[in-house]
Structures are given as structure tokens and as C-alpha cells.
């Protein structure tokens, strides 16, 4: 069998690999070992019986999407049946404590891999024994600790694959200088020891994108707005723009990034290197929103012509491809970061994104002060309460709302909330009664709000013993 | 829109060079792959060879290693075929085309998506 | 080299008649071909990608069809548009070699 018959259901074009060289990897081509290796199709009842204890399951996520040049991390995440995990010898155990369907284990392994290596590796010390190799026969590397990696994972993905050693996650980054555009598919097939064999426990598939747009997502934030994901803003308070780029691998950190603004409000264009931008809507109305980020990013250059050739013949691309070796770097130029040798040549790549929103912009309450606060005289039954009045004005649009949150001196903790409708003239003046229990120093949060927004305003306010003579303090504003 | 603008013709002396231009407008040039095509007079249609147009890699049709050369110039999003050597075997219309994909399960499919014009090359003395 | 094998490498038919042309490999390619459309003077269009796939714009009249080595283009009701020579073309290795192209004329 080879690699395409065991991954993937399709036998991929040679054109295609060709196309998308993955370096580092190898053709799928090559020869699966399946003595070492056992393939079951999906629904052989041998899957059942490939983990004691239940099936273990593999969560594979990427930070697709990539921008082509940069790289994409591929993570796998074996999920194991429930009071099961693996410890720091690589080893599976039941978890103490923990009851399952079979209840308490007596026996803490659920796998003693440590046993059974050190049962079957005896030969000639070395630990290089002939079921110590990958799926297509490559050794696995020694570094330290890996007789503590039980597990096989094979990635495919264009027709290539990886192999890779590991424990119960593992990452992969795969640049994508030579990815053709748009989603391709992963698949990842998962193996753990099995004496002097291996046996497949999970196999997942995910879709990746790759992409010669830069991924670009834009948070919008306004002070007083209600709903900051609504794309509905206030005329007349600034708009903060934020600018997010989605480049995980930084592949873009040695890029001149600029930013293209246009707010669709005839005031032109604005451009900045800076990824926040504010912007004061003074219409009411419905805008169109439009931004180009561009990143000037160091490029490969193409390679300078070739000196004439010879007209003796040369092998094939078909003959090439067969003997292609995926650990050896691809050809010059492949790199998409490689910068020119040759002075003063031009290797700059341009990158484009574009982010696009249409906003409408309403009226709404700009701004909120407590112009005065007046301790109301209460009657007899209340001795320990206070009534105060706070006179408030505001800015902007009529609200239609008012909440209190008196809360502590650190304006925390909160004591009190209370909301309730208002009925407010053109002149936005209006007068809120609180009752406070007892003295002492208390923040006080007012709100006002419509439909679209909501204003606030905080003090902080000392209410003094039931004593007749003490003034109330409004003690910072 | 994706466009190959090429210049309609060209009159080369035997044994001479030429290089033939492919300005590409509409897309993200450094994102495709470029492909030339030769068609001879009355003949079908014959694949010459492919260039990457982001990092300059190269695959040639075996007959054509020794007569075309294969380029790009990023800055002004052109690719560049030259033929060497000509004799009047090499008088024919030859197109530039972008090598377009699409996405398939499991894999991307390919084809010529976007074709200039051609140029006519007359070898003549 | 992959060989594709045109045929016919000519036909004359009238407006609104069906027509199959067809195009083998010399090896299986995996529905890794495409269809060309040339009008006289002009340069090639794309049809069908991936045997079976329509491009943009293409009428439905067009269709593609196929597998393995053996891989056809139906055209239903033929258009006077539709007259000009048809090329098949593989994608399942280097050279992506072209077949020898069918003349459509007009009977």
C-alpha cells in the first residue's frame, strides 16, 4: 500500500504536489509499512477494541486563516475515555479517585508503555530496533525522553505527509509559501504502541485556508454607544477604529503595515500607520465604511535568468518528482522571506486586506452631569435613611431611562441598582431621588439611556449622620 | 477584471532572440502561477512551460528547455517568455495564461482560467 | 508524458444537433482535465475544470463527463457561437499536456 491509499480517499496529481511542495515533507507515494502499521477502514469492528476503556478521540484546530508566505500551526489533542490521562513517563493511568462505568480501577495503568519498552528494546543498546521507525520505515529521532512518546501521528494534507513522534498533543507548523489558495483539507491518522507494533486509535480531518488577503477584523468601540455590535453609532462623540490582524506566525512583523481609511462621510481619505483610527460621524445617516491595509513585506526574488544551457538532455520533472527528497530544502527562492542578494533590487511583496461595514449613525445622549444634590428632610419613621436629589442635565438626544448603582467608596461592591423611566423636556434637566441607608461614603453611578445609547456619570458622595446641622459633600466629581 | 494584455506582434530574424511580455491586471499577480502556450499556424495548442510568479520557480515542457527562458518582474506584474536561437519553426502565435485552481475534496484542481491575446512571432529574414 | 488522443479530430454539424467530443489518456488521470473553447483568431476559454466543473459564465448547454482515461464534452442544441476548435488538457503531471483539438464546423 502507499500513503494515498491509507490517508486519503483520492489519489492526488503529481501536477498538484508539484505545486504545493511542503517542505520537509514527503510524497504520498511512498510505501506505508503495513505489517508495522495495520489500516482499518472505518466501521471495521477492530476500532473497538483499539483503546481499553472506550475510544479515544483527537481534536485537530489550526490558526487558519494564513496569509500564503506565513506559516500555519496544526495542533492534535488526543481526548481520552473519561478517568484516564497520561503522566509524565508518557505512561496511560486511571486518574485516582475517579469512577467510571467499570468502576475503580485496582490496576493504575491503563498502558505501561515503560514496561513493555524496556521488555522489547534490548537489542544491542542502542534502542534501534527495527519497530522503532515511522509508517514509511525513517527512524524515529532520539532526542531525550522519546522512549516517553507513545504515539504516531501521520499528517496529509496535498498529497504529501508528516510524520511525527509524540504524546497526547502535538503541534505541526507547516509554512505556506507554496500552497495553492483557498481551503484545503488536513487529515491526521493517530497510532499508539502496541508491543512491537502500533495500532491506529483516532483519525479527524479539518479544513484550513490559505489566503493572498490579509485577514483583517476591525473592533469598533464609542463611548455612550449601547450596543457596540450592533453597527449602530452616536452623531457627534468619536468612534475608536481597532484594527486586529490575523497573523499568528508573525509574518508579518518585518512588513511597513498602512492603513487606508475611507468613513464614507465625504471626508476623504485618511491614511496612518497607526492600527487605531478615531472618526466623528456629525450626519445622521447610513455609511459606507472601507479600509485597505497594506504591508509592504520583504519578498523572495526571483531567481536572475539562467546562463544559456546546455542542449544536452535533462531527466524529466516526472523522473525529478520520484526522487524528490522532502528533508532536503527546496529549490532557491522557495523561501518566502529570502531577500535578494543583488544590490538594489527591488523584493518587496505588497499584501492586501480589506475590511468593509456599513455603520448608520443616530442621535444619542452625549453627555451626562449631576449639576446639584440636595439631602430632602425626611420624616420621623426613617431616622437612619437619607433621601438625596441629584439635578441632572444632558447632551444630545431626549433619554428615555434613568438608572442608579450606589455601590461602595471603591465603587465595587454593589449595594443598589434602580432603574425606572423619564419624562424629559427639550431642556434636559431632571431631578433623581435615592434613598441612602445610613452614612458614610458611597459612589454613585447615573445612567442615562434610549434606544441606541447610554450615558453615565459617577460621584462620590458623603452622607452624613441624621444631624441636622451636617452638610451633605459631594466628595469628587 | 483579470487581464493578460500581450503586444500583438513581432518580426525577429533568424538566429536572433526575442523576449515576449505578459502584463497581468486584476488579480494578485504574485498569487498564480503563469503558463505559455505555443500554437502554430493552423496547429493545435502546446504547453511550453510554467512560472511561479511569487518566488520564480520554473517547470518546462522537455522540448522547449533549450529555446525559452521563463520570467516575472513583480513590480510591474509581467511575466516574460524569451525564445532563442529562432528559426522559422519557432514562427507561431504564443500565449500567456494564469494557471487557475479551485477548490476540490480532497484536493485543488487546475486549469488555464485566463488567457492573453497571444503574440504572433514571425522568424523571417 | 501523459498522450491525450482527440477524436474526432474534425466534425460538421448543424445548428441545434447534439455533439459528443471525446478525449483519452494515456493513463488514468483522475478527472485532472480541463476544456478549451477557440475561436477562430482568438485565444482559448476555459469550459470545464476538474472534468465535470462549469466554468463562470459558461452556458449549461456545455458538459463535461468521465473518468479514469476516458473523458468527453457534450454540447446540447449547438449554438452558431458555439463553432471553433475544442481542447482537452490533463493536470495529473508536468508537461499538462494538451489533446490534439476537434474542429467544430458548421454543416
Known amino acids: 500500500k502507499r500513503f494515498h491509499d491509507v490517508l486519503g480517499n483520492e489519489r492526488p496529481s503529481a501536477y498538484m504536489r508539484e505545486h504545493n511542495q511542503l517542505n520537509g515533507w514527503s510524497s504520498d507515494e511512498n510505501d506505508w509499512n503495513e505489517k508495522l502499521y495495520p489500516v482499518w477502514k472505518r466501521g471495521d469492528m477492530r476500532w473497538k477494541n483499539s483503546w481499553k476503556g472506550g475510544r479515544v478521540q483527537a481534536v485537530l484546530t489550526s490558526d487558519s486563516p494564513a496569509l500564503v508566505g506565513s506559516n500555519i500551526t496544526f495542533a492534535v489533542n488526543l481526548i481520552f475515555p473519561r478517568c484516564q490521562k497520561e503522566d509524565a513517563n508518557g505512561n496511560i493511568v486511571y486518574e485516582k479517585n475517579c469512577r467510571n462505568e467499570a468502576g475503580l480501577s485496582a490496576d493504575p495503568y491503563v498502558y505501561n508503555w515503560t514496561a513493555w519498552s524496556e521488555d522489547s528494546d534490548g537489542e544491542n543498546g542502542t534502542g534501534q530496533s527495527h519497530h522503532n521507525v515511522f509508517p514509511d520505515g525513517k527512524p524515529f529521532p532520539h532526542h531525550p525522553g522519546w522512549r516517553r512518546w507513545n504515539f504516531i501521528y501521520v499528517f496529509h494534507t496535498l498529497g504529501q505527509y508528516f510524520q511525527k513522534l509524540g504524546r497526547c498533543s502535538v503541534r505541526v507548523s507547516v509554512n505556506t509559501a507554496n500552497v495553492t489558495l483557498g481551503p484545503q483539507l488536513m487529515e491526521v491518522t493517530v497510532y499508539r504502541r502496541h508491543g512491537r507494533a502500533y495500532v491506529p486509535i483516532a483519525q479527524v480531518k479539518d479544513v484550513y485556508v490559505v489566503t493572498d488577503q490579509i485577514p483583517v477584523f476591525v473592533t469598533m468601540f464609542q463611548k455612550n454607544d449601547r450596543n457596540s455590535s450592533d453597527e449602530t453609532f452616536l452623531k457627534d462623540l468619536p468612534i475608536m477604529f481597532d484594527v486586529l490582524i490575523h497573523d499568528p506566525s508573525h509574518f508579518l512583523n518585518y512588513s511597513t503595515i498602512n492603513y487606508k481609511w475611507s468613513f464614507g462621510d465625504n471626508t476623504g481619505l485618511f491614511v496612518s500607520t497607526n492600527h487605531t483610527v478615531n472618526h466623528t460621524y456629525v450626519l445622521n445617516g447610513t455609511f459606507s465604511l472601507n479600509l485597505t491595509v497594506k504591508a509592504a513585506a520583504p519578498g523572495p526574488c526571483p531567481p536572475p535568468p539562467p546562463p544559456p544551457r546546455p542542449s544536452k538532455p535533462t531527466p524529466s520533472l516526472a523522473t525529478t518528482l520520484k526522487s524528490y527528497d522532502s528533508n532536503t530544502p527546496g529549490p532557491a527562492g522557495d523561501n518566502p522571506l529570502e531577500l535578494s542578494r543583488i544590490p538594489d533590487e527591488n523584493c518587496q511583496i505588497n499584501r492586501y486586506g480589506h475590511f468593509q461595514a456599513t455603520i448608520t449613525i443616530v442621535e444619542g445622549i452625549l453627555e451626562v452631569n449631576i449639576i446639584q444634590m440636595t439631602d430632602v428632610l425626611m420624616p420621623v419613621p426613617w431616622p437612619e435613611s437619607s433621601l438625596i436629589d441629584f439635578v441632572v442635565t444632558c447632551q444630545g438626544s431626549i433619554p428615555t431611562e434613568v438608572c442608579t448603582i450606589i455601590s461602595d467608596p471603591t465603587c465595587e461592591i454593589t449595594q443598589n441598582t434602580v432603574c425606572s423611566p423619564v419624562d424629559v423636556d427639550e431642556m434636559c434637566l431632571l431631578t433623581v431621588r435615592r434613598t441612602f441607608n445610613g452614612s458614610g461614603t458611597y459612589c454613585v453611578n447615573l445612567t442615562l439611556g434610549d434606544d441606541t445609547s447610554l450615558a453615565l456619570t459617577s460621584t462620590l458622595i458623603s452622607v452624613p449622620d441624621r444631624d441636622p446641622a451636617s452638610p451633605l459633600r459631594m466628595a469628587n466629581s | 477584471q483579470v487581464q493578460l494584455q500581450q503586444p500583438g506582434a513581432e518580426l525577429v530574424k533568424p538566429g536572433a532572440s526575442v523576449k515576449l511580455s505578459c502584463k497581468a491586471s486584476g488579480y494578485t499577480f504574485t498569487s498564480y502561477w503563469m503558463h505559455w502556450v505555443k500554437q502554430r499556424p493552423g496547429q493545435g495548442l502546446e504547453w511550453i512551460g510554467e512560472i511561479n510568479s511569487s518566488n520564480g520557480r520554473t517547470n518546462y515542457n522537455e522540448k522547449f528547455k533549450t529555446k525559452a527562458t521563463l520570467t516575472v518582474d513583480r513590480s510591474s506584474s509581467t511575466a516574460y517568455m524569451q525564445l532563442s536561437s529562432l528559426t522559422s519553426e519557432d514562427s507561431a502565435v504564443y500565449y500567456c495564461a494564469r494557471l487557475g485552481y479551485y477548490s476540490g475534496s480532497p484536493y485543488p484542481y487546475y486549469a488555464m482560467d485566463c488567457w492573453g491575446q497571444g503574440t504572433s512571432v514571425t522568424v523571417s529574414s | 508524458d501523459i498522450q491525450m488522443t482527440q477524436s474526432p479530430a474534425s466534425l460538421s454539424v448543424s445548428v441545434g444537433e447534439t455533439v459528443t467530443i471525446t478525449c483519452r489518456a494515456s493513463?488514468?488521470?483522475?478527472?485532472?482535465l480541463a476544456w478549451y473553447q477557440q475561436k477562430q483568431g482568438k485565444s482559448p476559454q476555459l469550459l470545464v475544470y476538474a472534468a465535470t466543473n462549469l466554468a463562470d459564465g459558461v452556458p449549461s448547454r456545455f458538459s463535461g463527463s468521465g473518468s479514469g482515461t476516458q473523458y468527453s464534452l457534450k454540447i446540447n442544441s449547438l449554438q452558431s457561437e458555439d463553432f471553433g476548435s475544442y481542447y482537452c488538457?490533463?493536470?495529473?503531471?508536468?508537461?499538462?499536456?494538451f489533446g490534439g483539438g476537434t474542429k467544430l464546423e458548421i454543416k
Open positions: 493513463e488514468n488521470i483522475y478527472s485532472n
Open positions: 488538457q490533463h493536470f495529473w503531471n508536468t508537461p499538462p499536456t
